[in-house]
């Protein structure tokens, strides 16, 4: 029986050009975490295997940093990074737990300010 629960940062926002930490935490289970996969809607961002370490997909290699812990740091954010992210915990003996994070990337306050107040 799967008793664990995934706690995530939920809905988060960050500024364009900035960075964000995607973090999940598995609790209420003694199951061993063997691997955590980080995914967007239709593509893999990264995998952290407890034994074999990190795999980072080539599309994200330049702007994803492993960690902290089993989390993932996404850097140089663009508006296109807005969307759902999933942490998939592979555990033994429980099986798979999935958490969801929604990230909204906002135009920076400087950009907003510049758009609202134009110099005559």
């Amino acid at each position: 029986m799967m008793t664990g629960t995934i706690e995530t940062t939920g809905n988060i926002s960050a500024e364009k050009g900035g960075s964000i930490i995607l973090q999940c935490h598995l609790s209420s289970t003694t199951a061993q975490v063997t691997q955590v996969n980080w995914e967007q809607q239709d593509q893999l961002l990264a995998i952290c295997n407890a034994d074999l370490g990190w795999h980072i997909s080539p599309s994200f290699k330049d702007r994803v940093a492993p960690g902290p812990g089993l989390g993932l740091t996404l850097q140089s954010l663009t508006v296109n990074d807005t969307g759902e992210y999933f942490c998939i915990y592979h555990t033994y003996p429980d099986g798979t737990y999935t958490g969801r994070i929604f990230l909204e990337v906002l135009e920076s306050s400087v950009a907003e300010h510049g758009a609202r107040f134009q110099i005559p």
Epitope: Q43, D51, L52
Partner: antibody, heavy 119, light 107 residues
Framework: QVQLVQSGAEVKKPGASVKVSCKAS????????IYWVRQAPGQGLEWIGG????????NFNENFKGRVTLTVDTSISTAYMELSRLRSDDTAVYYC????????????WGQGTTVTVSS | DIQMTQSPSSMSASVGDRVTITCKAS??????VAWYQQKPGKAPKLLIY???YRYTGVPSRFSGSGSGTDFTFTISSVQPEDIATYYC?????????FGGGTKLEIK
């Protein structure tokens, strides 16, 4: 350039053990995992397992658990795969491979070591 | 374990033909798929990974696509040197598994 050079062919009796070596050069050994893949005659590829040379951690295909030991000697940049209690269906070419930077895909391969198990 | 079902198991093509090989995973593997080429008596070579990136030095006639459970490997214009067996492989979760292979012959 990256090179993985494996030990020579082996002929073993059923029940015996074999230890295959894989000498790495052309890169920092502890920075990349070493994986092992085998191929029986006329058959496809089968992943045996992998070892993280920086800490010695290993991950195995359950089909081989209890029979395979993956080790490294970082002082000579060499990985080893030992398979015990050999059976005739362990007859295969055994390959060591190395991943890409932060990648699990098998970017570099050794030349292969033929292990024949026969009474 | 995740099964990777590759088809066809063998095929014959003429020089210049477009060739497509498919690989179906028994469960979701996101984009954690690679394709290898193996010539007789030689070690496999990485061609495509993740699953549309060509590895260093791989000719542009080789390409890959897919996500989730369905993946495709294409040779846009087959050359005589492409005679080989091609394998897909998933590294989404251990044990990492390969497809059964597709043997390509030239007519």
């Amino acid at each position: 350039q990256v090179q993985l050079v494996q030990s020579g062919a082996e002929v073993k009796k059923p029940g015996a053990s074999v230890k295959v070596s894989c000498k790495a050069s052309g890169y920092t050994f502890i920075s990349y995992n070493i994986y092992w893949v085998r191929q029986a005659p006329g058959q496809g590829l089968e992943w045996i397992g992998g070892v993280n040379p920086s800490n010695g951690n290993t991950n195995f295909n359950e089909n081989f658990k209890g029979r395979v030991t993956l080790t490294v000697d970082t002082s000579i940049s060499t990985a080893y795969m030992e398979l015990s209690r050999l059976r005739s269906d362990d007859t295969a070419v055994y390959y060591c491979t190395r991943g890409n930077y932060y990648g699990y895909e098998f970017a570099y391969w050794g030349q292969g070591t033929t292990v024949t198990v026969s009474s | 374990d995740i099964q990777m079902t590759q088809s066809p198991s063998s095929m014959s093509a003429s020089v210049g033909d477009r060739v497509t090989i498919t690989c179906k995973a028994s469960q979701h593997v996101s984009t954690a798929v690679a394709w290898y080429q193996q010539k007789p008596g030689k070690a496999p070579k990485l061609l495509i990974y993740s699953p549309s990136y060509r590895y260093t030095g791989v000719p542009s006639r080789f390409s890959g696509s897919g996500s989730g459970t369905d993946f495709t490997f294409t040779i846009s214009s087959v050359q005589p040197e492409d005679i080989a067996t091609y394998y897909c492989q998933q590294h989404y979760s251990t044990p990492w598994t390969f497809g059964g292979g597709t043997k390509l012959e030239i007519k």
